[in-house]
Interface confidence: low
């Protein structure tokens, strides 16, 4: 018995061939011997089966002795043994129809679980293997689950259903809703304007929701909400903003925030959350602000950084075009009795300068100048 696999919603063509290469009488029946379709001369006739409006044949092939049964918009319950009766012969074809669907929605938040459910006819025992866009394989039976979806899981998932040594392939497009970056860090000198950007890693026609930026300043004992906003069809409107600092927010995507001045009391970590309409859970992006200040107080030249710096970062003080006077994996360095000239404070990571602040030290009878 020939086995043919079909996909729910697709069209399948079951073949039936006579030895005579001419149009002769044929019938297609199901396993209950109910006639589906056949011919009467050059006319197509249909029986009382449930397939009535979805069954068809190709009259153009009859003259060649080919009498296919075409079933459109396949349903799982179309799985059956179909019998073609032609020339006193019976050709049997077993059709197995499978469906593969993603749980509830194909747009899922980062960190959520994806469950793929296989619909299969009774009595079948298929195996399923799915490959994610990043090349990860998962295998299973009736259901397959992937926990903790990541941004790289966005794209086309290719799933192969295997039954009776035959396979049928499904492609499911999954969109993982996330920010492009899980976290970002901004390095600024004291007094500079700070730009925070939160680009999304997906595009949708309409985007509606609400968001908030909570900020934990390094110097503060608790976090506070800096701004709350609404998102309606990709338009941003601010609901509430603190007085200190007074953030400004762009009206269009990508989400964009401006802090007028980088000050040591603002250095720290923020968490922007975005709740999307009709989605449970929230998108998160962490943002960090590191602020540098270089000062000269009497005979002491000091460079300090505030905010979440890593222990591998190096803080240095050097006189322009000279070797560093002091270089430590610390958040503050200083030089006593600095000689006159342009001093540079550098925060670097493996030789790459992340932040630089210059301070001019005048001869001892003058006052320092900060460029």
């Amino acid at each position: 018995k020939k086995v043919v696999l079909g996909k729910k919603g697709d069209t399948v063509e079951l073949t039936c061939t006579a030895s005579q290469k001419k149009s002769i009488q044929f019938h297609w029946k199901n396993s209950n011997q109910i006639k589906i379709l056949g011919n009467q001369g050059s006319f197509l006739t249909k029986g009382p089966s449930k397939l009535n409006d979805r069954a068809d044949s190709r009259r153009s092939l009859w003259d060649q002795g080919n009498f296919p049964l075409i079933i459109k918009n396949l349903k799982i319950e179309d799985s059956d043994t179909y019998i073609c009766e032609v020339e006193d012969q019976k050709e049997e074809v077993q059709l197995l129809v499978f469906g593969l669907t993603a749980n509830s929605d194909t747009h899922l938040l980062q960190g959520q679980s994806l469950t793929l459910t296989l619909e299969s006819p009774p009595g079948s025992s298929p195996s399923v293997q799915c490959r994610s866009p990043r090349g990860k394989n998962i295998q299973g039976g009736k259901t397959l689950s992937v926990s903790q979806l990541e941004l790289q899981d966005s794209g086309t998932w290719t799933c192969t259903v295997l039954q009776n040594q035959k396979k049928v392939e499904f492609k499911i497009d999954i969109v993982v809703l996330a920010f492009q970056k899980a976290s970002s860090i901004v390095y600024k000198k004291e007094g500079e304007q700070v730009e925070f950007s939160f680009p999304l890693a997906f595009t949708v026609e309409k985007l509606t929701g609400s968001g908030e930026l909570w900020w934990q300043a390094e110097r503060a004992s608790s976090s506070k909400s800096w701004i709350t906003f609404d998102l309606k069809n990709k338009e941003v409107s601010v609901k509430r903003v603190t007085q200190d600092p007074k953030l400004q927010m762009g009206k269009k995507l990508p989400l964009h925030l401006t802090l007028p001045q980088a000050l040591p009391q603002y250095a720290g970590s923020g968490n922007l959350t975005l709740a999307l309409e009709a989605k449970t859970g929230k998108l998160h992006q962490e943002v960090n602000l590191v602020v540098m200040r270089a000062t000269q107080l009497q005979k002491n030249l000091t460079c300090e950084v505030w905010g979440p710096t890593s222990p591998k970062l190096m803080l240095s003080l050097k006189l322009e075009n000279k070797e560093a006077k002091v270089s430590k994996r610390e958040k503050a360095v200083w030089v006593l009795n600095p000689e006159a000239g342009m001093w540079q404070c550098l925060l670097s990571d493996s030789g790459q300068v992340l932040l630089e602040s210059n301070i001019k030290v005048l001869p001892t009878w003058s006052t320092p100048v900060q460029p």
């Epitope: 490959r131 090349g135 394989n137 903790q148 086309t156 290719t158 392939e169």
Partner: antibody, heavy 119, light 113 residues
């Protein structure tokens, strides 16, 4: 399961470039990420980078950044690895490898291509 | 990059005896998302590409004899050949694939005593 067949041995002069091919057959090419791993004579294995058959995205090891280029030709299910500015220490067997069992645990390997850099 | 260190560099074992190879990663390769150790073991014979023996630290690749087993978690892993056969003479490598770039140990040569 996919099979990987690589191009033949190459002899190159220092400073030149070499382009090694790896043809995939027997599987859905777009489903696989193909990595390149090299092995200098008598030495261990060193990962150079990968290219996605699905979208052509690449990820190179820091050491080879700027010298290696990985490309793909979906019409022939072939990936290419080009290494430029060759030096004698690039003499090695270059393998393409892929994974069917788990990410980057390579259960599918090409037969290897010997690249000799000599003046 | 995660550094993988194997010990010993070479090992001579009598036929039928147990061979044990250790592998240490410079940081944990245990993923909390999948609760799996992203560690593989390979066998390489002269003139051949490496052959995958074990993945997820302890899952045997299909067709690999059950005398090969992998164990360990986090940063410390072991490949055990319970009863060494002549055809097991080869170089064995561990590899982490938890963090890009994937990195290999320096290899352990297994010979017959």
């Amino acid at each position: 399961q996919v099979q990987l067949v690589q191009s033949g041995a190459e002899v190159k002069k220092p400073g030149a470039s070499v382009k090694v091919s790896c043809k995939a057959s027997g599987g859905t090419f777009s489903s696989y990420a193909i990595s390149w791993v090299r092995q200098a004579p008598g030495q261990g294995l060193e990962w150079m980078g990968w290219i996605s058959g699905y979208n052509g995205n690449t990820n190179y090891a820091q050491k080879f950044q700027g010298r290696v280029t990985m490309t793909r030709d979906t019409s022939t299910s072939t990936v290419y690895m080009e290494l430029s500015s060759l030096r004698s220490e690039d003499t090695a067997v270059y393998y393409c490898a892929s994974s069917d069992v788990s990410p980057d645990a390579f259960d599918i390997w090409g037969q290897g291509t010997t690249v000799t850099v000599s003046s | 990059d995660i550094v993988m260190t194997q010990s010993p560099d070479s090992l001579a074992v009598s036929l039928g005896e147990r061979a044990t190879i250790n592998c240490k990663s410079s940081q944990s390769v245990l993923s909390s998302s999948y609760n799996k150790n992203f560690l593989a073991w390979y066998q390489q014979k002269p003139g051949q590409p490496p052959k995958l023996l074990i993945y997820w630290a302890s899952t045997r690749e299909s067709g690999v004899p059950d005398r090969f087993s992998g164990s360990g978690s986090g940063t410390d892993f072991t490949l055990t050949i319970s009863s060494l056969q002549a055809e097991d003479v080869a170089v064995y490598y561990c590899q982490q694939y938890y963090s890009a770039p994937p990195t290999f140990g320096q290899g352990t040569k297994v010979e017959i005593k």
